[in-house]
């Protein structure tokens, strides 16, 4: 009956962690004697190829300084405890502790048997590192040029993480990769770039990080922050201002970042009705008269700049009973 070595084609281990490389001789055959078990790294330099051996009488040996005896152990193999006890070598599973990038590669598990001869199996050990992810908005100011408004960083992954963005805005991503502080790892930075305008301020975009160490992609929301000058509109005019009306108000509606620092009401004619009183963002009209037949201007200032809106007013002789709807500026 033929025997075979059962190994996994590929084993993944976490950088700094412990991994087991399974190796079993199958099937159990009466009288099949395992005289030696060895683990080798065929692709390593000649003096580092022999990684571990298990001799039925001598027990385990770990000759190479890499990985070295302090980081290697046989999980189940047992030497004979005395002259009357047979060694148990069918399970030659090898454990590697404190995984380093240099441990990655092919490992050959070999059983020297009698009378079947030598049989072997090969496993590829991949060393992976789970990256640490973070994303943050960059405080930017309104501009005509494309600017980085958010960063997503996946630190010290192996292999490098894949970063993408989920957003309805008109954007592009710029990615850079640098070596991590841990040898063999990579830090990936993705820059979410757009022409910063008020439309982007307060919008939430999502950084999506994919890595084989994650069960599912990491999704990190980021709320954009764009400093922009006030975007102004005027509301309150209902196309039914008539002489003598006393309940009229204009409101200066603003979107801005940061908050407005000042409001200024004026008219294009240069004449300002005395019965109109500016109260911050509101213009309160005590009584409409013919001087209101003009265009009112609201100018708003913030730390970035200023914005303005105009509202044309038409004063009627008598109320419009047709029920005109309110219109904005």
């Amino acid at each position: 009956q033929d025997v075979r070595v059962q190994v996994l084609p590929e084993v993944r281990g976490q950088l700094g962690g412990t991994v087991e490389l399974p190796c079993h001789l199958l099937p159990p055959v009466p009288g099949l004697y395992i005289s030696l078990v060895t683990w080798q790294r065929p692709d390593a330099p000649a003096n580092h190829q022999n990684v571990a051996a298990f001799h039925p009488k001598m027990g385990p040996s770990f000759p190479s300084p890499k990985p070295g005896s302090e980081r290697l152990s046989f999980v189940s193999a047992k030497q004979s405890t005395g002259q009357d006890t047979e060694a148990e070598l069918q399970d030659a599973t090898l454990a590697l502790h404190g995984l380093t990038v240099e441990d990655e590669g092919n490992y050959t598990c070999e059983f020297a048997t009698f009378p079947k001869g030598s049989v072997r199996g090969m496993t590829w050990l991949r060393v992976i590192a789970k990256p640490k992810n973070q994303a943050e908005a960059q405080k930017v100011t309104f501009s005509q040029d494309p600017t980085t408004v958010a960063l997503c960083i996946s630190k010290e992954g192996r292999p490098p993480a894949r970063i993408s963005w989920l957003s309805s805005l008109d954007w592009e991503a710029k990615e850079t990769q640098v070596s991590g502080t841990l040898a063999g790892t990579v830090t990936v930075t993705s820059r979410f770039t757009l022409v910063p305008s008020g439309r982007a301020d307060g919008v939430t975009v999502t950084c999506k990080v994919e890595h084989e160490s994650f069960e599912e992609p990491a999704l990190i929301p980021v709320t954009l922050s764009v400093r922009y000058p006030p975007e102004v509109s005027i509301s309150g005019y209902d196309d039914n201002w008539y002489l003598g009306r006393t309940d009229a108000t204009l409101s200066c509606d603003v979107r801005s970042n940061p908050e407005p620092t000042g409001y200024d009401w004026s008219t294009t004619s240069g004449t300002f009705p005395t019965s109109a009183v500016a109260q911050g963002s509101q213009l309160v009209i005590h009584a409409v008269d013919s001087l209101f037949n003009t265009t009112f201007v609201c100018t708003v200032t913030n730390a970035v700049g200023m914005g303005r809106a105009e509202q044309v007013i038409f004063v009627r002789e008598t109320p419009n009973t047709a029920g005109a709807g309110a219109t904005g500026g």
């Epitope: 004697y33 030696l36 080798q40 022999n50 051996a53 009488k57 004979s80 047979e86 070999e110």
Partner: antibody, heavy 116, light 107 residues
Framework: QVQLVQSGAEVKKPGSSVKVSCKAS????????IHWVRQPPGKGLEWIGA????????NYNQKFQGRVTITAVTSTSTAYMELSSLRSEDTAVYYC?????????WGQGTTVTVSS | DIQMTQSPSTLSASVGDRVTITCRAS??????VVWYQQKPGQPPKTLIY???YRYSGVPDRFSGSGSGTDFTLTISSLQAEDVAVYYC?????????FGQGTKLEIK
């Protein structure tokens, strides 16, 4: 401790047979193969074959196939190597040896001289 | 059968010398090679197994290397008690085969 004690020296005529014994002690006899290796005077080592006492399975070097029979008697923990149709070139020291990783335990050797 | 060819057949060296014995297999045997030392009137003793692993109790002046078809036994500083015949043996494939031996003498 493990001991392999072999039978005494033999002088045989060409064409005859010889049967050498190897009594084992100090371990579970049925768990390990007993191998036989010979060494002609002033020459190197040559593997002859082996027996597994647990099921009496045997395995031979093709060179000796048909001329050698290796057996084991579990009740006495003794292995035997019988070589027939002896010729002068079979003159050698015959060792029984126990494979524990390598040939770690050896009998003291039995000198077989084939001479007319 | 796999042939194991040792060289040299005889080697004469002085105490303190570095001595090298080579063994070439007729086909790939991996690292499945043992080196034995045999003194007159005694059975062989294991020095090295799996090509480079030193057996317990063997002085560290003995070392082995090689894989595939070419193997080396090195004695870093020859001692008088190292006078013996040295054999390589492959256990990769049945039947086990030995080299013809290297006789080491002191000058």
């Amino acid at each position: 401790q493990v001991q392999l004690v072999q039978s005494g020296a033999e002088v045989k005529k060409p064409g005859s047979s010889v049967k050498v014994s190897c009594k084992a002690s100090g371990y579970i006899f049925t768990s390990y193969w007993i191998h036989w290796v010979r060494q002609p005077p002033g020459k190197g080592l040559e593997w002859i074959g082996a027996v597994y006492p647990g099921n009496s399975d045997s395995n031979y070097n093709q060179k000796f196939q048909g001329r050698v029979t290796i057996t084991a008697v579990t009740s006495t923990s003794t292995a035997y190597m019988e070589l027939s149709s002896l010729r002068s070139e079979d003159t050698a020291v015959y060792y029984c040896t126990k494979l524990v990783g390598t040939f770690d335990y050896w009998g003291q050797g039995t000198t077989v001289t084939v001479s007319s | 059968d796999i042939q194991m060819t040792q060289s040299p057949s005889t080697l004469s060296a002085s105490v303190g010398d570095r001595v090298t014995i080579t063994c070439r297999a007729s086909q790939n045997v991996g690292i499945n090679v043992v080196w034995y030392q045999q003194k007159p009137g005694q059975p062989p003793k294991t020095l090295i197994y799996s090509a480079s692993y030193r057996y317990s109790g063997v002085p560290d002046r003995f070392s082995g290397s090689g894989s595939g078809t070419d193997f080396t036994l090195t004695i870093s500083s020859l001692q008088a008690e190292d006078v013996a015949v040295y054999y390589c043996q492959q256990y990769n494939t049945n039947p086990f085969t030995f080299g013809q031996g290297t006789k080491l003498e002191i000058k």
